[in-house]
């Protein structure tokens, strides 16, 4: 990039430069035209038959250098070949020699600083590319020369350019002073300022675009060179921070469009949002999740959203005593997770009525909560009450929903208990055809004994036609009808209100043989 | 502003010389072409010739070739056009005319003439 | 050398109309013609050159284009002090001519 400093070809007025010595034959300003056919203000010198050694001077304004410390001038100038002037001299020249000169305000005058190399400072004596050539008969011809020079190191406030002519007939068309300088450079979402560089290279430090991070590792730089131009060399630059993406080459960063997020800083662009999630401004770093759905802490910012599952379905009781299998089906919506557990929760009704949570003593197995597998046995359940499991399907957004947990029920109502079973039966007499048998009366929970039934028959005889029965509402009965000197296997069981209980252990009984032996008291 | 000052008015006899001068004041001299044209009483401008004076050597139109010589002196700033063998219609008004642009300081073309002297009136009678 | 015929050789015009005169060379001469303009009794005026750059203090009613063989002087509103003859001059050639002018004149 160039930054001008002075450029002939712009101004409208006269230019008015210093000239010297004050003579005939010196540096004079006319008007010229230029490519486009513009007039341009410009510098004519013809003195080829001067004396030798004597030098005409032209100095331009002072220019402000800004910040520049090395200038550049382009100059444009033609020149009259020697060979084509008849009265041109020896010492007629095809060279003019430039120099500059630095203060710090604008203090030079017609006599100061002496013109002379030192205290003005050569830059180069520049010779002619092209001569405008003139044989008879023909038109002149030529063409412009373009020389650019190099100046400084400049350290002061300004500078003036001099022209020094020693017997050249030429014109100087145009100066173009100006200095080189980095331009601003965004490159990686890194922006590098403009910059005018006062060395071979200068590091120039970067900074973030808007809405970039810092990718980790050193601070950017660039170098910017002497000649304007930025050093090639990789950047360890920027990177669109959540929610913005690069753009334009990687120049800005853009922010993601409504209905897309980018979740972290760095390369990437802006994805659409995730299932059940929206973005309703731009530059997102997350989408929102819709109503009724969520994310688990643990999910990742670009996980979809999901829901607490349905009930679990169709529950299948099996009560087995104290026991209780009960199994489900798993729900017919998920939420849209793989997390799915089980949990349940119990009530018990006595028989009076009175419900409350399930006490203590009943035990789940694998457990009342996080179950993956869709059933579980309850144990411990007692006689005559009613149970209320309500099983849930949970997963890991299920505890940031509000509201109820939806589950599907299932009842239960365990038997009444039945009386023990009767044991320590007693023959109190026996004779050739009848036993008087005796028991304990046993405790039964749910209400007292009603009655008895005895189960016999005679050993040996299996058959279900061989066995009878007997009830009683007390404690005792008497076999009749018997065998003389048989053996006969005798059962008693209990009926409360719950029904009856379960026959105790045989017991062997056994007939008189005769009537004079009498009754005899037979112990089990 | 420069102004180029023609020498007076002369009468001529058939197949006699005249040498009519242009001195120019101000500035630049030598890198501007002077041309010289002439108009006849009721006609129109015609072209006789052009001079560069740092180049000394000038350019005619076929029509005056051999009978016109344009010459010029860098040291008075003054150019001259003689023309010779006079004859009537030679009677005319000569301009002498220089370039709008120095020969150094256009891209494009030293000869469009925006500077003209006030004119010489040269008649030829016998 | 290079013939210039200009057309018409004179019109007549009333203030504030459009006056156009043409000139054709007999041979390219690119973009290296200009236009004068004289009035009785004076030096010609440079009005136009290359083709179509007007010199400095050239009102701005005038105009040029053209390139090649054919060019074209235009006055697009005539003025009282426009009144007078103008030529066109090629410069294309070692050897200079002019056309033989147009008489602009008040209707």
């Known amino acids: 990039l160039e930054e001008t400093l002075l450029n002939t070809k712009l101004e409208t007025a006269d230019l008015k430069w210093v000239t010297f010595p004050q003579v005939d034959g010196q540096w004079e300003e006319l008007s010229g035209l230029d490519e486009e056919q513009h007039s341009v203000r410009t510098y004519e010198v013809c003195d080829v038959q001067r004396a030798p050694g004597q030098a005409h001077w032209l100095r331009t304004g002072w220019v402000p250098r800004r910040g520049a410390v090395h200038v550049y001038a382009t100059l444009r100038f033609t020149m009259l070949e020697c060979l084509s002037l008849p009265r041109a001299g020896r010492s007629c020249k095809e060279t003019f020699t430039v120099f500059y000169y630095e203060s710090d305000a604008d203090t030079a005058t017609a006599l100061t600083p002496a013109w002379m190399e030192n205290p003005y400072i050569k830059v180069d004596t520049v010779a002619a590319e092209h001569l405008t050539r003139k044989r008879p008969g023909a038109e002149a011809t030529g063409k412009v020369n373009v020389k650019t020079l190099r100046l400084g190191p400049l350290s002061k406030a300004g500078f003036y350019l001099a022209f020094q002519d020693q017997g050249a007939c030429m014109a100087l068309l145009s100066l173009h002073l100006f200095y080189k300088k980095c331009a601003q450079l965004t490159v990686n979402l890194t922006r590098f300022p403009e910059t005018v560089p006062r060395e071979l290279v200068v590091p120039v430090a970067g900074s973030c675009v808007v809405d970039a991070v810092p990718a980790p590792g050193p601070s950017p730089s660039l170098y910017c060179r002497e000649d304007g131009q930025w050093a090639e060399q990789p950047v360890t630059g920027c990177s669109c921070a959540p929610g913005f993406e690069a753009a334009e080459g990687n120049t800005k960063c853009r922010a993601c469009a409504q209905g897309t997020f980018k979740p972290l800083s760095g390369e990437g662009s802006c994805q659409p949002c995730p299932a059940n999630s929206h973005s309703n401004t731009i530059g997102s770093a997350v989408c929102q999740c819709r109503v009724g759905y969520f994310r688990a802490r643990t999910d990742p910012r670009g996980a979809p959203c999901t829901t607490p599952p349905s009930a679990p379905r169709s529950v299948v009781s099996r009560l087995n005593g104290s026991s209780l299998h009960l199994e489900w089906s798993a729900p017919l919506e998920s939420g849209g997770r793989e997390d799915l557990t089980y949990a349940l929760r119990c009530r018990e009704c006595r028989p009076g009525g009175s419900c409350a949570p399930c006490g203590g003593d009943l035990t789940f197995d694998p457990g009342p909560r996080d179950l993956v597998e869709p059933w579980v046995v309850v144990r411990g359940l007692r006689p005559d009450f009613t149970y209320t499991f309500e099983v849930t399907a949970l997963n890991g957004v299920s505890s940031l929903a509000t509201g109820p947990v939806p589950f599907e029920p299932v009842n239960v109502t365990t038997d009444r208990e039945v009386p023990p079973a009767v044991s320590d039966i007693r023959v109190t007499r026996s004779s050739p055809s009848s036993l008087s048998l005796a028991w304990a009366v046993p405790r039964a929970p749910s209400g007292a004994v009603l009655d008895y039934e005895v189960k016999y028959h005679e050993k040996g005889a299996e058959g279900p036609s061989s066995v009878r029965f007997l009830k009683t509402s007390e404690n005792r009965a008497e076999l009749r009808g018997l065998k003389r000197g048989a053996s006969y296997l005798v059962q008693v069981r209990a009926r409360s209100e719950a029904g009856y209980g379960p026959f105790g252990q045989e017991h062997h009984s056994q007939t008189q043989l005769d009537e004079s032996e009498g009754w005899r008291e037979q112990l089990a | 502003q420069v102004q180029l000052v023609q020498s007076g008015a002369e009468v001529k006899k058939p197949g006699s010389s005249v040498k009519v001068s242009c001195k120019a004041s101000g500035g630049t001299f030598s890198t501007y072409a002077i041309s010289w044209v002439r108009q006849a009483p009721g006609q129109g401008l015609e072209w006789m010739g052009r001079?560069?004076?740092?180049?000394?050597?000038?350019n005619y139109a076929q029509k005056f070739q051999g009978r016109v010589t344009i010459t010029a002196d860098e040291s008075t700033s003054t150019a001259y056009m003689e023309l010779s063998s006079l004859r009537s219609e030679d009677t005319a008004v000569y301009y002498c005319?220089?370039?709008?642009?120095?020969?150094?300081?256009?891209?494009?073309?030293?000869?469009?003439?925006?500077?003209w002297g006030q004119g010489t009136l040269v008649t030829v009678s016998s | 050398d290079i013939q210039m015929t200009q057309s018409p050789s004179s019109l007549s015009a009333s203030v504030g109309d459009r006056v156009t005169i043409t000139c054709r060379a007999s041979q390219n001469i690119n973009n290296f013609l200009n236009w004068y303009q004289q009035k009785p009794g004076k030096a010609p005026k440079l009005l136009i050159y290359g083709s179509s750059i007007l010199q400095s203090g050239v009102p701005s009613r005038f105009s040029g284009s053209g390139s090649g063989t054919d060019f074209t002087l235009t006055i697009s509103s005539l003025q009282p002090e426009d009144f007078a003859v103008y030529y066109c001059h090629q410069v294309s050639d070692t050897s200079d001519t002019f056309g033989q002018g147009t008489k602009v004149e008040i209707k």
């Open positions: 001079i560069i004076p740092i180049f000394g050597t000038a």
């Open positions: 005319a220089r370039s709008s642009y120095t020969i150094l300081t256009t891209y494009y073309n030293y000869n469009a003439m925006d500077n």
